[in-house]
């Protein structure tokens, strides 16, 4: 018998070594996902790791390369898409990022059934984007601001529109203030579901003011960055919907859909649209003044070929406690009927919940219910709805999947995701195959995260996808932190809290504590999510305390937190941290003479407004491209939560909320103020405008700025930055380089 | 391995009808999708028919209602019923996977539509 002495485990327990920031910078710790590039009920393409094109087929466990990697190397691609008859891939190469989702590529079609590139007639360069239709393979792409359509892939282009100009005209594609704040794509051009019709929205920009910025590059004279920027109050784009029919595409041209009356009376939005046959669309269209919301149901007419959306097929919805629907409006999903819908909205209780709507809104049947909310519908088919929500055990930062029996009454509820790897898996989300066949399930955390998949009807796992056995393994020797997910209950508010603490934790002892917050409205930070980050690493090495805390203003727990900043915005958000920050103070283990605040974006604007309240809490602060007025920010964004910054609406409380006002009481702490010069989301002009009110309250601060970098401070940025941020937190904290 | 072997083709009039058969020697999975193209001499090959192990199917825009891919899972055979034939369906037809794997070409069968 051989005993091992104890002292091996201590040795064992010495390679264990805390993360280090070059673990983070060099994204030593990442995770992969898998989702499944669906092709049908039972198969799905995925690019391997040594970048073949492979089709997965899972009722006969094959698989089989359709494009190798010599060929998508042959062009540099690192992107494809297979067109639906799987004729023809298109290969993309030359990304060139433009926004948070535009970008420019060149693309290629390579031929399946031929085994070459399709030469004749090709793609002019660059592209802004580019798909197939849902059924063949016809081509629709937007190049210079117009719409061109390709029957074929060899065939000469139709051009649709012709009035597209640079920074004027938008066909097919968003303006800057419709892709960060409405679409979220880079797209704005909807097939019909068999290809039969194209929608396209042309933005008009024509009146909308700029904002020129430099950008410095490396010539004698720097470049002017010009963007139509409409900012809060400012004049909006135009937007018109249009519809053409692509098998004869000159017949009649594209016909204009109506925007119902109610919201053509005064500025307007569209904020959506979705196909529900190839002869029926539904239209969302947005007041302005972002309460109301008009859902209009259209119909193809044969005689005049022009499209018809009678008063019938208009529903509104409407808020009278805030903006209408959560951060953005949400989209219906159709049933099999192409009249009845099912979407998320408020209940009469003020929980965003999923309705089945069949004739109007008021009639509407409510599917879930309770003091939780319904978050997305993923799919509805002939017999089951699956959605997810955070209703399970009451913690808002979960996300699990749900099916609903919608075939049999009653409607009966499952949770496909509750038990499956409990500990590890708390936040999911999923991806369906064509009739909800089969589904992939990808957990976030908050354990490592892990991609499996699962059989539509009876939901059991086939196989995993993806489980990070490489990032298991290599977090075997790593002290990570300790994660706890707590809420705290002050005045009838439920403040929920993650704190992230040191590995040898003890609450005998005094740590530095670092609050990161974000904030912004409809947002959330607590969530069950796996991690390792910069904060991670401060926890694990530096021996922080981090906390994140969702206060009034955040999403997923009722419309009351969610609407509570409305008009209002950097006044409750800031208290609610500063009262969490008191409650952990009073837990004892939280040294209240090294509290620091961190955030970007609008966590930047938080953090500020924070440093700024006088409370004396904060001995440090950092502040990442903060908003700084909401007079400069973009109008879709401020207005939602804002309203106009008019005498006769809300300017009051714009000149109230600016950090600029607060210039004084930043006297008492140590600030980092930090923006790259090329932001074209939160401008430079925001940081500027602090810097300034300082130097003129002769008050002392710290600046980084990064130039020629956007609002994501991406590249060599990140790294400069995040060692820059750590020096400074090390020496608030009087912690040994 | 599998090979797949077309059959069925030949000579017939306008407005005619044809059968056409492919049998995978090997085994092959009624889950498999599978297609049938065609190619004229000089021109690129093309895509008639497709149809998924879910039998779903996709049909080229000229095929306009004439033709039907269909399967037999008992028999490992895949059939495309070509109806209302016209001379510019004259070409070789094959059947391969869908998409197509360039290994699997077979020797197709010749279809000839002239009166």
């Known amino acids: 018998i051989v005993l091992r002495p104890s002292r091996v485990h201590n040795s064992e327990e010495n390679t264990m070594r805390a993360l280090t920031l070059k673990d983070i910078l060099n994204g030593t710790f990442s995770y992969k996902t898998f989702f499944p590039n669906w092709i049908s009920g039972q198969e799905y393409l995925h690019q391997s790791a040594d970048n073949n094109i492979v089709l997965y087929n899972i009722e006969t466990g094959q698989s089989y390369t359709i494009l190798s990697n010599r060929t998508m190397k042959s062009v540099n691609a690192s992107n494809y898409g297979l067109s639906p008859d799987r004729q023809f891939v298109y290969l993309e190469s030359d990304y060139s990022k433009l926004w948070r989702y535009s970008y420019t590529a060149t693309y290629y079609i390579y031929d399946l059934s031929n085994g070459e590139f399709v030469r004749g007639n090709e793609l002019p360069r660059p592209i802004q984007y580019l798909c197939w239709s849902p059924v063949g393979s016809k081509l629709a792409y937007v190049y210079q601001n117009n719409i061109y359509l390709k029957q074929r892939p060899g065939d000469p282009p139709f051009q649709i529109t012709f009035n597209g100009r640079e920074n004027k005209i938008f066909n097919g594609i968003p303006d800057w203030v419709y892709e960060e704040e409405m679409l979220a794509t880079k797209y704005a051009l909807w097939w019909s579901p068999n290809g039969k019709f194209l929608a396209y929205a042309e933005f008009n920009d024509t009146d909308i003011p700029v904002i020129a910025y430099s950008y410095y590059g490396d010539e004698q004279y720097p470049r002017t960055i010009n963007i139509p920027y409409p900012k809060a109050g400012a004049k909006n784009p135009v937007v018109r919907i249009f519809i053409i029919d692509t098998t004869y595409p000159a017949y009649v041209g594209p016909q204009e859909v109506p925007v119902p009356a109610m919201i053509a009376s005064s500025d307007y939005y569209f904020s959506w649209l979705t196909w529900v046959t190839d002869e029926r669309v539904c239209l969302q269209w947005l007041k302005r003044v972002q309460n109301v919301s008009v859902l209009s149901i259209c119909d193809f007419r044969e005689d005049w070929q022009t499209w018809d959306c009678p008063k019938t097929q208009e529903h509104i919805e409407e808020s009278r406690t805030g903006w209408a629907g959560g951060f953005f409006v949400s989209t219906p999903v159709f049933s099999y009927d192409a009249i009845s819908y099912y979407k998320i909205f408020s209940d009469k209780d003020g929980y965003k919940h999923i309705h089945y709507i069949k004739d109007t809104v008021e009639n509407a049947i409510q599917i879930t219910s309770g003091k939780w909310e319904a978050i997305n519908i993923f799919r509805v088919t002939q017999d089951s709805l699956f959605y997810s929500s955070n209703e399970f055990e009451e913690y808002p930062g979960r996300r699990n999947i749900y099916r609903i029996s919608i075939g049999s009454y009653p409607p009966s509820k499952k949770c496909v995701t509750c038990h499956l790897r409990k500990e590890r898996c708390q936040y999911y989300t999923a991806s369906f195959s064509d009739y909800a066949k089969y589904y992939a399930l990808v957990c976030y955390g908050p354990g490592i995260p892990i991609s499996t998949l699962h059989d539509g009807r009876t939901d059991q796992e086939i196989k995993i996808l993806e489980e990070n056995k490489e990032l298991e393994n290599a977090l075997k020797n790593i002290q990570l932190p300790k994660e706890e997910i707590k809420k705290l209950e002050v005045d009838e508010i439920t403040l929920w809290y993650k704190m992230i603490l040191p590995p040898q934790f003890d609450r005998s002892k005094k740590y530095p504590l670092l609050i990161q917050v974000y904030g912004g409205p409809c947002s959330q930070s607590v969530r069950s999510v796996f991690a390792v980050n910069w904060i991670s690493y401060l926890a694990s090495k530096e021996g922080m305390v981090i906390a994140l805390v969702d206060g009034r203003g955040t999403a997923f727990q009722g419309d009351k937190l969610l609407y509570a900043v409305y008009r209002k915005l950097g006044v409750y958000e800031v208290e609610d941290q500063i009262t969490a920050v008191r409650k952990f103070i009073e837990m004892g283990f939280i040294d209240e003479k090294r509290i620091a605040i961190w955030g970007w974006s609008y966590g930047g604007y938080v953090s500020s407004l924070a440093l700024a309240s006088g409370t004396g809490l904060f001995k440090c602060g950092i502040a990442v491209a903060p908003v700084s007025s909401w007079e400069y920010y973009a109008s879709v964004y401020t207005e939602r939560f804002m309203g106009l910054p008019t005498k006769d609406d809300n300017l009051e409380h714009y000149k109230n909320s600016t950090v600029m006002a607060r210039a004084e009481y930043f006297r008492n702490v140590d600030y980092l103020l930090i923006h790259g010069t090329a932001d074209d989301n939160v401008h430079f002009q925001n940081s500027a405008q602090i810097a300034k009110a300082l130097v003129n309250a002769q008050v002392d601060f710290q600046a980084m700025w990064y130039s020629d970098q956007n609002h994501g401070l991406s590249g060599l940025s990140t790294n400069h930055l995040y060692t820059h941020m750590t020096h400074f937190l090390k020496q608030c904290f009087s912690l040994s380089d | 391995d599998v090979q797949l072997v077309e059959s069925g083709g030949g000579l017939v009039q306008p407005g005619g009808s044809l059968r056409l058969s492919c049998v995978a020697s090997?085994?092959?999975?009624?889950?498999?999708?599978m297609a049938w193209y065609r190619q004229v001499p000089g021109k690129r090959r093309e895509l008639v028919a497709g149809i998924t192990g879910g039998g779903e199917t996709n049909y080229a825009d000229f095929v306009g209602g004439r033709f039907t891919i269909s399967r037999d899972n008992a028999k490992n055979g895949l059939y495309l019923q070509l109806n209302g034939l016209k001379p510019e369906d004259t070409a070789a037809y094959y059947c391969?996977?869908?998409?197509?794997?360039?290994?699997?070409w077979g020797q197709g069968t010749q279809v000839t539509v002239s009166s």
């Open positions: 391969n996977f869908w998409p197509p794997l360039i290994n699997y």
């Open positions: 090997g085994r092959l999975s009624s889950s498999n999708s």
